[in-house]
């Protein structure tokens, strides 16, 4: 019965069994709900918008790493719908702290203004880097069907034309 179905399962009335919700492919995220016994008739998979990615399954699309704005690093590989961005060496005027454990964001570059003397990335650097934060553009992506729904992320979302 419905109550026995798991987080990513719906009750199949034909077979009388819990069935796995269809997983989405890389670069997609679930649209509408499926799980704990129920599946919306219009449940499906929608593409990640340009600035987000997903590995598929039941994962929602996540924003790409902001190499330049947050990490103060160069972009080694720009992200796409299926992959996160990969960051490269620090931007000019920034350096990587040696022998420092990675935090939840990985390696973050720090301003040469705060660097110890003779830090190799900062030798010859002028007055450091200006705080040039790129503007963050929010996604205006809507949903395929124009009605209120609850996504798997748990966020209600009303799409309007």
């Amino acid at each position: 019965e419905y109550s026995n179905c798991g987080e990513n399962e719906y009750y199949n009335q034909t077979t009388g069994l819990c069935q796995e919700c269809p997983p989405c492919g890389p670069g997609e995220e679930p649209y509408l709900s499926c799980g704990y016994g129920t599946k919306d008739e219009d449940y499906g998979c929608v593409p990640c918008p340009a600035e987000k990615f997903s590995k598929g399954g039941y994962q929602i699309c996540r924003r790409h790493k902001d190499c330049e704005g947050f990490f103060r690093a160069t972009v080694l590989t720009p992200g796409d719908m299926e992959n996160d961005a990969e960051c490269g060496p620090c931007l000019p005027g920034y350096y990587m702290l040696e022998n420092r454990p990675r935090n939840i964001y990985g390696m973050v570059c720090y301003s040469c203004l705060l660097a110890p003397p003779n830090t190799k990335e900062c030798v010859g650097a002028t007055s450091g880097a200006s705080a040039n934060f790129p503007g963050t553009s929010g996604s205006s992506t809507l949903s395929p069907f124009q009605h209120a729904h609850k996504e798997l992320s748990g966020q209600g979302h009303l799409a309007t034309a």
Epitope: G27, D42, C45, S140, T141, L142, S143, P144, F145, A161
Partner: antibody
């Protein structure tokens, strides 16, 4: 075997009614949402109606809302479009199209049936 | 409603050419962009879905790209069988809307 085959087109007088059918074969019809899309002579494609796999969700374009009704009979693998209060601007080729199982596009199309509204 | 604009209504090219057809949405459609081919006999087929994914059975000479409001379909090596009208379509929000179409002809 053609997966989707429309029928029911023909000449109708303005204000008249017509019911189009779309017979599905070769796939599990009851698993798929279905659409009607039309194309007026020498014009582009226009989506007009959608019905989900079990008929819970139905949507229409503003141009046909209140005049057209989409329905389906999963036992008979058939999609319908009941058209009433027909106008000359409803003259078009009417296609039924299948929604891909999980994704939001038309992955299989019928050959179309022609409806002419004229006195 | 979201308006889909294909500025080029007809396009003439030679066999073997690389052809690009453009499509613009009136607002961000977040990669919910599909391309269809309509042959002169009226037959409609899906080519590309979700901006860049090739539908099964579609030749690899077809490709799609774009993001936000601007999208394109490219045929890398035009063949005789590609003579058709090409429509873009947004599936981002109802009502689903199509571009006006681009008719591809042989020079």
């Amino acid at each position: 075997e053609v997966p989707l085959e429309e029928s029911g087109g023909g000449l109708v007088k303005p204000g008249g009614s017509r019911k189009l059918s779309c017979a599905a074969s070769g796939f599990t019809f009851s698993d798929h949402g279905m659409h009607w899309v039309r194309q007026a002579p020498e014009k582009g494609l226009e989506w007009i109606a959608y019905i989900s796999s079990g008929s819970s969700n139905v949507y229409y374009s503003d141009t046909v809302k209140g005049r057209f009704t989409i329905s389906r009979d999963n036992a008979k693998n058939t999609l319908f479009l009941q058209m009433t209060s027909l106008r000359s601007e409803d003259t078009a080729m009417y296609y039924c199209a299948r929604r891909e199982l999980l994704r939001f596009y038309f992955d299989v199309w019928g050959q179309g049936t022609s409806v002419t509204v004229s006195s | 409603d979201i308006q889909m604009t294909q500025t080029t209504s007809s396009l003439s090219a030679s066999l073997g050419d690389r052809v690009t057809i453009s499509c613009r949405a009136s607002q961000d459609i977040g990669n919910h962009l599909n391309w269809y081919q309509q042959k002169p006999d009226g037959t409609v087929k899906l080519l590309i879905y979700y901006t860049s994914r090739i539908h099964s059975g579609v030749p690899s000479r077809f490709s799609g790209s774009g993001s936000g409001t601007d999208y394109s379909l490219t045929i890398s090596n035009l063949e005789q069988e590609d003579i058709a009208t090409y429509f873009c379509q947004q599936g981002n929000t109802l009502p689903w809307t199509f571009g006006g179409g681009t008719k591809l002809e042989i020079k």
